[in-house]
Amino acid sequence: SGTTNTVAAYNLTWKSTNFKTILEWEPKPVNQVYTVQISTKSGDWKSKCFYTTDTECDLTDEIVKDVKQTYLARVFSYPAGNVESTGSAGEPLYENSPEFTPYLETNLGQPTIQSFEQVGTKVNVTVEDERTLVRRNNTFLSLRDVFGKDLIYTLYYWKSSSSGKKTAKTNTNEFLIDVDKGENYCFSVQAVIPSRTVNRKSTDSPVECMGQEKGEFREI
């Protein structure tokens, strides 16, 4: 039960990419405000986004403390202008979120091809190691720092003149592939965490093609 004229939040949803993590919910408030609390399974509740009229709350700062922990959030509803008011049970109306484990569930952001370099019939393609908001010793960690060898990249590459996509995989951020001399190739990469059962793949990077400024060609 809750305070008169307040409704409980619903459709609590975690939106997370490369550990940037926002809790969203409904409905848009009418004469009410929300406060969010977050905790690990064994920890204490911490309040965030106090008395907000938003229907989202950025919880990144909390979850990056330990991305392998499982988190639970709850959204409290209060009457606008009377936030001390409680329901008949002596506490405000609230709704729990689904559990969320960032390491297992954060979406992999769209990767970027940093560079490619052709030397004869070999091309070295480098994927940008994206910075996350996870910190260690006051330094922001990269995606590779966080996931280590759990993270792989799939490279799709194809001759500009054909449609069939060859693939290569790496558990670093670099590919070394064989190409036909005199042919222009295009490239796209995808981040993958094979050990996951959900959110295994990122969206594809923008396509980069030889003959464009990102690449470098050296005839040996």
Partner: antibody, heavy 120, light 107 residues
Framework: EVQLVESGGGLVQPGGSLRLSCAAS????????IHWVRQAPGKGLEWVGY????????YYADSVKGRFTISADTSKNTAYLQMNSLRAEDTAVYYC?????????????WGQGTLVTVSS | DIQMTQSPSSLSASVGDRVTITCRAS??????VAWYQQKPGKAPKLLIY???FLYSGVPSRFSGSRSGTDFTLTISSLQPEDFATYYC?????????FGQGTKVEIK
Amino acid sequence: EVQLVESGGGLVQPGGSLRLSCAASGFTISGYWIHWVRQAPGKGLEWVGYIDPANGFTYYADSVKGRFTISADTSKNTAYLQMNSLRAEDTAVYYCARDYGSVRVFLDYWGQGTLVTVSS
Amino acid sequence: DIQMTQSPSSLSASVGDRVTITCRASQDVNTAVAWYQQKPGKAPKLLIYSASFLYSGVPSRFSGSRSGTDFTLTISSLQPEDFATYYCQQHYTTPPTFGQGTKVEIK
């Protein structure tokens, strides 16, 4: 439980067409890659092609290029192999298989296969 | 395309025998080689991945090794259920390619 079930095989005349289906359960195909592999009677395994259902990217063996098309419907969790201009040498059991997607593990689950016979 | 040359094409062995099957890649494939077992009328089953790693649920009598571009599947003590055809496959480059297969028969 991960399962792949092929269907759609049968007898077809040379020059004809056939569409095979590969229905997946126990996993979401968009998170993986699906390959088709065939085996002519009494012969070895021959890779046919793959699809990444997440983006529709495909690649085909030279022997089927231009005649076969792999597609996927992620809403049905099913991959397809459209075979056109069929020849006698396409007679085989056709398997779909799941590509785990890591640097190490490759085709970890296979369907039971469906027989395609091309004959007049 | 990379060729995988498998030998022998067939062999006869008895229960308890140590059996070795080899596969040679026509160029470097790193460790991107898998071994599959296939029984008549059935789909292939993954045995070994990444040249030497035993796939989940596969008996420990199966093992794999690599020496340069040569790959070996060993069955330390052949069991009745091991009589089947074995295939190697490289997945280092597209297209992935299979060896011709080795049929292990009862002596």
